[in-house]
């Protein structure tokens, strides 16, 4: 039997993935576990084996379809259990009726790219990767620039409360070389999180004219 | 084999209510939501609303929510639905469906005639 | 509400014809649509589910297509039992929305 408290979260990227992490203080280390997604209303089911993060947490992913194909929608609820092999039995460790569009965590933004560069300023565009298009345009991001020097914990948040896929960042220093990432949220769900950030892109300003103030 | 059974007619009168069933067999009954469509002579097919059997949890369609009450009985495995205030309008064919992935298994439709 | 719109109100077709019906939805609703049979005792059959898949019992002829809004059932060879009215129907929102139904007879 397994004791102390378990820890059961799930994350529908609003496409066709659903990423879970169960923690078990005091759980089984050498013992097969996984997850089982069974929807309400679709015929599909799948499971995921969970692999270990840590010393007491697993994760997994539960890949639902073609990664921009449309699984599940608001009208969804998916019952998901962690199932642990007890013998020639598996037993049911952790359950939840899970509402996709209530815990969302999209793919972070890709295709990061420095669209124009200035001595003090820069343009920076990106995409967002496998989003549902029933966010239409409510989606929000934030962006920081590390600067020489400083962590990225240091970096100051930038907020866009709306979907723009783009930013100009102002009061560089010239000549100088900087990393930016970005994040995106849906306006949409009560436990929904911020995507992770995405890789960072580095850039360096132009250097300032010669014989010029800057 | 999965089967939805409903009666085959009712005859009320007007500003009456009735209440129809659909009975399931051949599945876990408490596992898939049950929905309800009505059909006017003649006419298209519009959803009236679904239930949960397993929880008791319903969806209406916004347009029949003062008009439509949907309940389980989940030891007889049997679906209602209840009409109420009933005028010629409500006079229709009503079916019950199994929903997984569409509605799978429908009942052969309960004819409801309101008449004085 | 998503509005289904099956412009074709009947069709006729001869034995052995390739028919298809097509229905659009008034937004995308991702592939989270069915197509059903009313046979005329009114007797409601599941065809097609989530665009192209085959409901169980249901013969290979009939098969589904389309994407975003545009979707279509095809017959690829008309039988006699296939006289019926065909319904198109959305699962990507509450409420739920069928098309007016296309019926299809014999020539």
């Known amino acids: 039997a397994v004791n102390g408290t378990s820890q059961f979260t799930c994350f529908y990227n609003s496409r066709a993935n659903i990423s879970c992490v169960w923690s078990q203080d005091g759980a089984l280390q050498d013992t097969s576990c996984q997850v089982h997604a069974w929807p309400d209303r679709r015929r599909w089911n799948q499971t995921c084996e969970l692999l270990p993060v840590s010393q007491a947490s697993w994760a997994c992913n539960l890949i639902l379809g073609a990664p921009d194909s449309q699984k599940l929608t608001t009208v969804d609820i998916v019952t998901l259990r962690v199932l642990c092999r007890e013998g020639v039995r598996w037993r049911v460790m952790a359950i939840q009726d899970f509402k996709p569009f209530e815990n969302l965590r999209l793919m972070a933004p890709i295709s990061l790219q420095v669209v124009h560069v200035e001595t003090h300023r820069c343009n920076i565009s990106w995409e967002i990767s496998q989003a549902s298009h029933y966010f239409e345009r409510h989606l929000e991001f934030e962006a920081r620039t590390l600067s020489p020097g400083h962590t990225w914990e240091e970096a100051p948040l930038l907020t866009l409360k709306q979907k723009q896929e783009w930013i100009c960042l102002e009061t560089l220093t010239p000549d100088t070389q900087y990393e930016f990432q970005v994040r995106v949220k849906p306006l949409q769900g009560e436990f929904t999180t911020w995507s992770p950030w995405s890789q960072p892109l580095a850039f360096r300003t132009k250097p300032a004219a010669l014989g010029k103030d800057t | 084999q999965v089967q939805l059974q409903q009666p085959g007619a009712e005859l009320v009168k007007p500003g009456a209510s009735v209440k129809m069933s659909c009975k399931a067999s051949?599945?876990?009954?408490?596992?898939?939501?049950i929905t309800w469509v009505k059909q006017r002579p003649g006419q298209g097919l519009e959803w009236i609303g679904d239930i949960y059997p397993g929880s008791g949890n319903t969806n209406y369609n916004e347009k029949f929510k003062s008009k439509a009450t949907l309940t389980v009985d989940t030891s007889s495995s049997t679906a209602y639905m209840q009409l109420s205030s009933l005028t010629s309008e409500d006079s229709a064919d009503y079916y019950c469906?199994?929903?997984?992935?569409?509605?799978?298994?429908w009942g052969q439709g309960t004819t409801l005639t309101v008449s004085s | 509400d998503i509005q289904m719109t099956q412009t074709t109100s009947s069709l006729s077709a001869s034995l052995g014809d390739r028919v298809t019906i097509n229905c659009r939805a008034s937004q995308d609703i991702s592939n989270f649509l069915n197509w059903y049979q009313q046979k005329p005792d009114g007797t409601l059959k599941l065809l097609i589910y989530y665009t192209s898949g085959l409901h169980s019992g249901v013969p290979s002829r009939f098969s589904g297509s389309g994407s975003g809004t545009d979707y279509s059932l095809t017959i690829s060879n008309l039988e006699e039992e296939d006289i019926a009215t065909y319904f198109c129907?959305?699962?990507?929102?509450?409420?739920?929305?069928f098309g007016s139904g296309t019926k299809l007879e014999i020539k």
């Open positions: 051949g599945y876990t009954f408490t596992s898939h939501w």
């Open positions: 129907q959305q699962d990507n929102n509450h409420p739920y929305t």
């Open positions: 469906a199994r929903e997984r992935g569409g509605f799978d298994y």
